[in-house]
Interface confidence: low
Amino acid sequence: EEELQVIQPDKSVLVAAGETATLRCTATSLIPVGPIQWFRGAGPGRELIYNQKEGHFPRVTTVSDLTKRNNMDFSIRIGNITPADAGTYYCVKFRKGSPDDVEFKSGAGTELSVRAKPSAPVVSGPAARATPQHTVSFTCESHGFSPRDITLKWFKNGNELSDFQTNVDPVGESVSYSIHSTAKVVLTREDVHSQVICEVAHVTLQGDPLRGTANLSETIRVPPTLEVTQQPVRAENQVNVTCQVRKFYPQRLQLTWLENGNVSRTETASTVTENKDGTYNWMSWLLVNVSAHRDDVKLTCQVEHDGQPAVSKSHDLKVSAHPKEQGSNTAAENTGSNERNIY
């Protein structure tokens, strides 16, 4: 009878992460008697994957019923494959011996390659907000993919970006890889509704790339423009002064009215109106009783937006043109905001 040969018909097997790998092995003879073992790698440092005779190998199942006396199929299935399972697997026949079994013959080996999908790209922007015309950096990271070849693209509102740098690590051979990319984006005043998208294409994704997004609303700060105007009201001795706060983002805003440098009232923007571009408008009124003033009044609208240094706009109110009303010591009355007046 011819000497037993251990035949591993597949020189290589390619499996997607999470799936089951089938490693085929057949023997040409039932003699010599003894078990089959599977190893990953060769030499003294090899890793035992399956022992027909003993041991517990929860991820491994056999293709055939190894209890049958005539079995010569020693193929195994390894479940829930991960990139860490990549390597060359050897089917090894042992001769039954005393006290120990003796290695008899090994198959030629089957190289298991694992295709692992990249993780969903995570896009992160700068820690602090920036204003239009500034350039900000966004990073995109994806991990755990194999093989190493991968394509990463950046988009802003569907338009591909070109100013970015990408690295895939590690440079050498590895069971899996990571990609890190940094893109530079110039902000505009219209970017509140904009999105930055990182798109990753990999052989495991079958033409359906993964995308990670960042909303520029988390990154941009559009400072407000201020306009202070004076409007007469019904009573001759009252003047309505309006501070229009336009085109700001985010909403966090505090407004202070000053009369001749003294704080008259402070309020926080609450009910604002939203513009199509995502920025906000807000309006505050101050009702000034000019009869309480002997001299001209300098009214200042001071706005602190999103924790930034205050900006202000002033308006000089001439009191000489208005008749004085005796007995009134109230210089200004609080008004509501958001286009509401309370008298």
Partner: antibody
Framework: AVTLDESGGGLQTPGGGLSLVCKAS????????MAWVRQGPGKGLEYVAE????????YYGSAVQGRATISRDNGQSTVRLQLNNLRAEDTGTYFC?????????????WGHGTEVIVSS | AVTQPASVSANPGETVRITCSGD????YSWHQQKSPGSAPVSVI????DRPSDIPSRFSGSASGSTATLTITGVQAEDEAVYFC???????????FGAGTTLTVL
């Protein structure tokens, strides 16, 4: 490109023997099992014999078992099929195949074939 | 033995599936032959693998003891006889199906 060139066919006498040779090129010959598959006139394909990449293990189809010998020379990149005690039913085109693994389930390349006619 | 249909037909652009059923065969290959006696061409081997020079419209799958050759978007040049090859692990034998004639209408 993988090329498999068969030779040795022709008119053969019943009861006699033939020797077919397949010359391979375009790949690492010693890494692949090689096999012979034949096709009778107006018939389907039939597995004849196979040999492992090292040449140590031959396999034979039931129709030629005991009459055929398959061998290989990895240095010359050739595989040989010797078929004795020829019968009329051995008539057909004999193809040399490259097997990615072993068995017909892994045939990934074919030669152009050589025609064998067994007739008196 | 392995069994495959004697013939199938399809219009250009359609998807064609040819099955091959064995008793206990686990591993299959598919081969295209355009005329009797001419050299077959392997389109699928080891159940699902496709030689590098074969168009991607050819794909293979196997479940249990049945294998399927799928041609997605069949073309006129795909008209041929398709043989499945099977390794029967129960009898340790290599066998071919009788062939399926594909006609592209």
């Amino acid at each position: 490109a993988v090329t498999l060139d068969e030779s040795g066919g022709g008119l053969q006498t019943p009861g006699g023997g033939l020797s077919l040779v397949c010359k391979a090129s375009g790949f690492d010959f010693s890494n692949f099992n090689m096999a012979w598959v034949r096709q009778g006139p107006g018939k389907g394909l039939e597995y004849v014999a196979e040999i492992s990449d090292t040449g140590s293990t031959p396999y034979y189809g039931s129709a030629v078992q005991g009459r055929a010998t398959i061998s290989r020379d990895n240095g010359q990149s050739t595989v040989r099929l010797q078929l004795n005690n020829l019968r009329a039913e051995d008539t057909g085109t004999y193809f040399c195949t490259r097997n990615f693994g072993s068995s017909v389930s892994s045939i990934d390349a074919w030669g152009h074939g050589t025609e064998v006619i067994v007739s008196s | 033995a392995v069994t495959q249909p004697a013939s199938v037909s399809a219009n250009p652009g359609e998807t064609v599936r040819i099955t091959c059923s064995g008793d206990s065969s686990s591993y299959y290959s598919w081969h295209q032959q355009k005329s009797p006696g001419s050299a077959p061409v392997s389109v699928i081997y080891s159940n699902t693998d496709r030689p590098s020079d074969i168009p991607s419209r050819f794909s293979g799958s196997a479940s249990g003891s049945t294998a399927t050759l799928t041609i997605t978007g069949v073309q006129a040049e795909d008209e041929a006889v398709y043989f499945c090859g099977a390794y029967d692990s129960s009898s340790d034998s290599d066998i071919f199906g009788a062939g399926t004639t594909l006609t592209v209408l």
